[in-house]
């Protein structure tokens, strides 16, 4: 048993049928020795009495607030949350595995650019009695500050017969330089909180290996005289980090034709303009990527050839 | 994802072309060796980052570029050892901290060229014969080295007496090139950054 | 006594249907992750599905994902396996498990 | 996928021998493995989660070692109801695999 926060207590269990559970015994925070009563949450049934209740803990009926209590006053109050061990692997119950890029990825995190500020975000289909509080640090033998805001629901969607929540958070690295190279992880840990469920959930990751650019801005075209082929030309995202000619992107410019099935047109560059043939109905998209670390592709910026 | 390939204008800063080719190069060879040591701990995730070159060089402070110097974060330590007269540095060009940048790119190479060089003796002892450096790799090391043009003591390459232990040289194998593909990057971003100003 | 008994087998043609259900007692059904594990007659065992605990989180074999489907009911403390497109080697003994208990299991035999 | 490796893949021993099985795994799997028992014509059994730890109820002559890619289920001294096939699983990351079964037999 550990202490989340004040009053509040993390039992860990091995989770089976069975299971023999664990012996917990809790102390009235209280001067007075004598008269103390306990009962569980509004239940006015009397559990025992004195200044200690042990109890055995072995499945979420056991979970709750108990409350000690001295001639009709509250004393104190501990609530017991469970952690559940299945066959010795911690329980996922209240967050969706997102599958991407691997199984048993619960949390994602992204960033714009490397000036150590990234948003992580999760899914659960829980929509009452949740709470969620999430840490960060730079490394976790020592760690080095990072800065979370709390995590907020971001958005809500529905998948088949349910509905999916989006929760999400922005962290920053407390003190950051663009240009360092990362030796030690950014680690992201999460409590999730459901009812009397208690989970934790972590991620660790490079801020080089999450860079994801915003897309490219002002994409324009430019029709070449006599000619079918256009000049395409934008602008490195306003959110990416500079100087520019030391954080390159290199860019990929795709024709697409009104139907999917329509072959595409790729062309990959350095520059911020390109020459490509523009076919009626067709549009032109591009997208950007760390010019040196491949890290992902940015969401296309679109424009129609017309 | 194989690199754009910019043929270097006869004018262009002619470190440029030989760093892009070195970043493809241990981007390769890394991928080779992930996929040839899938059982080995080689991923990013599993394996300890070490930097072979930490307290003896300081390359991103040294090529730190100037509208990152206000960045009180990317002002750790700006102190190294500096030699002075590399042919990437048009004359016009030579300053005092470009020097010190680029003479902390050289060291670093020829670092990473002699840890591979032993490893590379030690892989070929191993009668399983998995995995070698790739020659194309080494090449394109001392090619940027040559074109760096510094002059420093050479360093013997290191030999061992012992039997390797070719599990861990292969481990070995994975951080280095893992710490040197990093290092690739911050090389081709200063030479990207010199080349434009 | 924590009792799990599968039901819901039997013999089908090739291309066909079934569904299995897992009837469980003697635990909190709805706090448990499930699982099915099916053996080939003379054979070992190879696991088919999993679900969590609040049916957050599936997870199939590569052989039978997109043709059959885990789901569960925890107001009748029961959980489903719905196979379709059957194939001759789906032919085994299904059995629920929640560790360490296991039911009995159900013959599925898939034949024309 | 996790390849379980089961060995021996039968074995014959007596009434009070002491008996090893070995699983071997094609990569790390931390500790992450389960040992079940299964009789003819009946269902598994499981025995050991976590490589080590017995579920309740399990008698103590079964215990679970290793980690990583080796594991071991030893039975101290076998009792003539401990005459079944073994099986090992990894529950690491999925798909879940299992060995291919270890068959105790009377000698």
């Known amino acids: 048993i550990w202490e989340l926060k004040k009053d509040v207590y993390v039992v860990e269990l091995d989770w089976y049928p069975d299971a023999p559970g664990e012996m917990v015994v809790l102390t009235c925070d209280t001067p007075e020795e004598d008269g103390i009563t306990w009962t569980l949450d509004q239940s006015s049934e009397v559990l025992g009495s004195g200044k200690t209740l042990t109890i055995q803990v072995k499945e979420f009926g056991d979970a709750g607030q108990y409350t000690c209590h001295k001639g009709g006053e509250v004393l104190s109050h501990s609530l017991l949350l469970l952690h559940k061990k299945e066959d010795g692997i911690w329980s996922t119950d209240i967050l969706k595995d997102q599958k991407e890029p691997k199984n048993k990825t619960f949390l994602r995190c992204e960033a714009k650019n490397y000036s150590g500020r990234f948003t992580c975000w999760w899914l659960t289909t829980i929509s009452t009695d949740l709470t969620f509080s999430v840490k960060s640090s730079r490394g976790s033998s020592d760690p080095q500050g990072v800065t979370c805001g709390a995590a907020t629901l971001s958005a809500e969607r529905v998948r088949g017969d349910n509905k999916e929540y989006e929760y999400s958070v922005e962290c920053q690295e407390d003190s950051a330089c663009p240009a360092a190279e990362e030796s030690l992880p950014i680690e992201v840990m999460v409590d999730a909180v459901h009812k009397l469920k208690y989970e934790n959930y972590t991620s660790s990751f490079f801020i080089r290996d999450i860079i994801k650019p915003d897309p490219p801005k002002n994409l324009q075209l430019k029709p070449l005289k006599n000619s079918r082929q256009v000049e395409v030309s934008w602008e490195y995202p306003d959110t990416w980090s500079t100087p520019h000619s030391y954080f390159s992107l290199t860019f990929c410019v795709q024709v697409q034709g009104k139907s999917k099935r329509e072959k595409k047109d790729r062309v990959f560059t350095d520059k911020t303009s390109a020459t490509v043939i523009c076919r009626k109905n067709a549009s032109i998209s591009v997208r950007a990527q760390d010019r040196y670390y491949s890290s992902s592709w940015s969401e296309w910026a679109s424009v129609p050839c017309s | 994802r194989n690199l754009p390939v910019a043929t270097p204008d006869p004018g262009m800063f002619p470190c440029l072309h030989h760093s892009q080719n070195l970043l493809r190069a241990v981007s390769n060879m890394l991928q080779k060796a992930r996929q040839t040591l899938e059982f080995y701990p080689c991923t990013s995730e599993e394996i300890d980052h070490e930097d072979i070159t930490k307290d003896k060089t300081s390359t991103v402070e040294a090529c730190l570029p100037l509208e990152l110097t206000k960045n009180e974060s990317c002002l750790n330590s700006r102190e190294t050892s500096f030699i002075t007269n590399g042919s990437c540095l048009a004359s016009r060009k030579t300053s005092f901290m470009m020097a010190l940048c680029l003479s902390s790119i050289y060291e670093d190479l020829k670092m990473y060229q002699v840890e591979f060089k032993t490893m590379n003796a030690k892989l070929l002892m191993d009668p399983k014969r998995q995995i070698f450096l790739d020659q194309n790799m080494l090449a394109v090391i001392d090619e940027l080295m040559q074109a760096l043009n510094f002059n420093s003591e050479t360093v013997p390459q290191k030999s061992s007496l012992e039997e390797p232990d070719f599990y861990k040289t292969k481990i070995k194998l994975c951080i280095l090139l893992h710490a040197f593909r990093i290092r690739a990057v911050t090389i081709d971003r200063v030479m990207s950054y010199l080349n434009a100003s | 006594e924590v009792q799990l008994v599968e039901s819901g087998g039997g013999l089908v043609q090739p291309g066909g249907s079934l569904r299995l259900s897992c009837a469980a007692s003697?635990?909190?059904?709805?706090?448990?992750?499930m699982v099915w594990v099916r053996q080939a007659p003379g054979k070992g065992l190879e696991w088919v599905a999993s679900i969590s605990s609040g049916s957050s989180n599936i997870y199939y074999a590569d052989t039978v994902k997109g043709r059959f489907t885990i789901s569960r009911d925890d107001a009748k403390n029961t959980l489903y396996l719905q196979m379709n497109s059957l194939r001759a080697e789906d032919t085994a003994v299904y059995y629920c498990a929640r560790n360490p208990y296991w039911g009995q299991g159900t013959l599925v035999t898939v034949s024309s | 996928d996790i390849q379980m490796t089961q060995s021996p893949s039968s074995l014959s021993a007596s009434v009070g021998d002491r008996v090893t099985i070995t699983c071997k795994a094609s990569q790390n799997v931390g500790t992450n493995v389960a040992w079940y028992q299964q009789k003819p014509g009946k269902a598994p059994k499981g025995l050991i989660y976590s490589a080590s730890h017995r579920y309740s109820g399990v008698p103590s002559r079964f215990s679970g070692s290793g980690s990583g890619t080796d594991f071991t289920l030893t039975i101290s001294s076998l009792q003539p109801e401990d005459f079944a096939t073994y099986y090992c699983q990894q529950y690491n990351s999925y798909p879940l695999t299992f060995g291919g079964g270890t068959k105790v037999e009377i000698k």
């Open positions: 003697g635990f909190t059904f709805s706090d448990y992750g």
